[in-house]
Interface confidence: medium
């Protein structure tokens, strides 16, 4: 007996042929003897089965004496034993239908699980393979779970079922909703404009939802909301902000916020949580603001940073040209009695310069410009 | 644990004033917006007034304005209601509740304090 | 002011029933909508904020729809501790409104 694997909401085409290269007389029916189709001369004729109006023959192909089956929009339950009656001989081939369905949306949060679940006859034993665009496999059998999907689990997932020796293979769109970085640090100067952008690493027809900027600033006991924002059709629109400090939206995607100011006050970090309409759970995406101050006060050049640094940033201060005064791995560093010119305040990581601030240093009878 | 406590509530004549207090614990009160909201006997809930973070912004129910005040004392974790000219009509009983969450819902409420206005 | 109304204003249930609850805005609010649950003498109980987001520690038989003015409190199958009276809330725009509410009493 011949096995056909067919795809849920797919079209299959049976074979039947004939030893004799002309049109002659052919049924097919179910396993229950039930006639499906066949044909009276040069004519289709339909019998009293469930695929009726899902039935169909190639009438071109008759007088070459092949006589095939096309079933339309499958369904599991077309699975079943298919009888070709020609020339006082019986055909039968076995349909398999499969149907593979990601469990709920196929739009998922990052960090949120997928399920993909195979529908499958009565009586058959497959097995499932599904690869990720990532190129990770995975197998099972009715189930296949995959637990805190991440951003490289977009894409296609290309599932292959296995059933007597034979495979059909299922592609399922998935989209991983998130941010595009999990994380993001800004590097300010004092009095600087700060932005914060929240690139989403994905695109849909409509985005509709709301968000908001939790801040813990390094000097604050406790976190505030800086802002809080609806997002329509990706439209943003605020709905609620801080008095201080008063951050500015822009009204499109991607989500950006402006802060007019760096101050040591604001350095901290923050958290962008986004809920989407119609999704339990939200994105999140955490900004880290780190500020520099050079400031000189009386025969003390002093340099600052507030905010989340890592232990390994060294700060340094040295006179233009020449090499580092003071440098290490704190938050702050000066220099007693500094030498007249301009002098350089510098955050880096590993010979990175990831922040600089000038300050001149005048003659001792004048007071210090800061450029 | 979110807990809230009302207190101050009591019968007033109309033309009277009273104040309301609601005591914050269990969460960082300076971060959240605050909000008053009443239920007259047998009625449905109104909302009555909110207030920011630090207390400089502040709305209130058109049937209110003029007449109630809402304030704040962030050192001492309370949040405050001043009620002068009450009328009749101000009878309710008085929640508090804390607005949390980006879609701004209450999500937590004290038990109540009653205001009677009656002569 | 936006009016919040509710229907119905009563519905008589019995255990193990659905139970539809909708709430409409006289102007569109996108999904700033929140449903509580207040009980006689008692604080209301926050439900659903976001139109959909269920409030941690909230049973999944409760559920929220709809977006812009249409919305819908369903309770798919009502246990005796579910009768109550409930209610809708926009959080769109000042001043906050509520709806009347409605009664779910038993049948």
């Known amino acids: 007996k011949k096995v056909v694997l067919g795809k849920k909401g797919d079209t299959v085409e049976l074979t039947c042929t004939a030893s004799q290269k002309k049109s002659i007389q052919f049924h097919w029916k179910n396993s229950n003897q039930i006639k499906i189709l066949g044909n009276q001369g040069s004519f289709l004729t339909k019998g009293p089965s469930k695929l009726n109006d899902r039935a169909d023959s190639r009438r071109s192909l008759w007088d070459q004496g092949n006589f095939p089956l096309i079933i339309k929009n499958l369904k599991i339950e077309d699975s079943d034993t298919y009888i070709c009656e020609v020339e006082d001989q019986k055909e039968e081939v076995q349909l398999l239908v499969f149907g593979l369905t990601a469990n709920s949306d196929t739009h998922l949060l990052q960090g949120q699980s997928l399920t993909l679940t195979l529908e499958s006859p009565p009586g058959s034993s497959p097995s499932v393979q599904c690869r990720s665009p990532r190129g990770k496999n995975i197998q099972g059998g009715k189930t296949l779970s995959v637990s805190q999907l991440e951003l490289q689990d977009s894409g296609t997932w290309t599932c292959t079922v296995l059933q007597n020796q034979k495979k059909v293979e299922f592609k399922i769109d998935i989209v991983v909703l998130a941010f595009q970085k999990a994380s993001s640090i800004v590097y300010k100067k004092e009095g600087e404009q700060v932005e914060f952008s929240f690139p989403l690493a994905f695109t849909v027809e409509k985005l509709t939802g709301s968000g908001e900027l939790w801040w813990q600033a390094e000097r604050a006991s406790s976190s505030k909301s800086w802002i809080t924002f609806d997002l329509k059709n990706k439209e943003v629109s605020v709905k609620r902000v801080t008095q201080d400090p008063k951050l500015q939206m822009g009204k499109k995607l991607p989500l950006h916020l402006t802060l007019p100011q760096a101050l040591p006050q604001y350095a901290g970090s923050g958290n962008l949580t986004l809920a989407l309409e119609a999704k339990t759970g939200k994105l999140h995406q955490e900004v880290n603001l780190v500020v520099m101050r050079a400031t000189q006060l009386q025969k003390n050049l002093t340099c600052e940073v507030w905010g989340p640094t890592s232990p390994k940033l060294m700060l340094s201060l040295k006179l233009e040209n020449k090499e580092a005064k003071v440098s290490k791995r704190e938050k702050a560093v000066w220099v007693l009695n500094p030498e007249a010119g301009m002098w350089q305040c510098l955050l880096s990581d590993s010979g990175q310069v990831l922040l600089e601030s000038n300050i001149k240093v005048l003659p001792t009878w004048s007071t210090p410009v800061q450029p | 644990e979110v807990q809230l406590v009302e207190s101050g509530g009591g019968l007033v004549q109309p033309g009277g004033s009273l104040r309301l207090s609601c005591a914050a614990s269990g969460f960082t009160f300076s971060s959240y917006w605050m909000s008053w909201v009443r239920q007259a006997p047998g009625k449905g809930l109104e909302w009555v007034a909110n207030i920011n973070e630090d207390g400089n912004e502040k709305y209130y129910v058109d049937s209110v304005k003029g007449r109630f005040t809402i304030s704040r004392d962030n050192a001492k974790n309370s949040l405050f209601l001043q009620m002068n000219s009450l009328r009749a009509e101000d009878t309710a009983v008085y929640f508090c509740?804390?607005?949390?969450?980006?879609?701004?819902?209450?999500?937590?409420w004290g038990q109540g304090a009653l205001v009677t206005v009656s002569s | 002011d936006i009016q919040m109304t509710q229907s119905p204003s009563s519905v008589s249930a019995s255990v193990g029933d659905r139970v539809t609850i909708t709430c409409r805005a006289s102007q569109g609010i996108s999904s700033w909508l929140a449903w509580y649950q207040q009980k006689p003498g008692k604080a209301p109980k926050f439900l659903i904020s976001?139109?959909?987001s269920l409030q941690s520690g909230v049973p999944s038989r409760f559920s929220g729809s709809g977006s812009g003015t249409d919305f819908t409190l369903t309770i798919s199958s009502l246990q005796p501790e579910d009768f109550a009276t409930y209610y809708c809330?926009?959080?769109?725009?000042?001043?906050?409104?509520f709806g009347q509410g409605t009664k779910v009493e038993f049948k």
């Open positions: 509740a804390r607005e949390g969450g980006q879609w701004l819902a209450l999500d937590h």
């Open positions: 809330q926009q959080a769109n725009s000042f001043p906050w409104t």
């Open positions: 976001g139109a959909s």
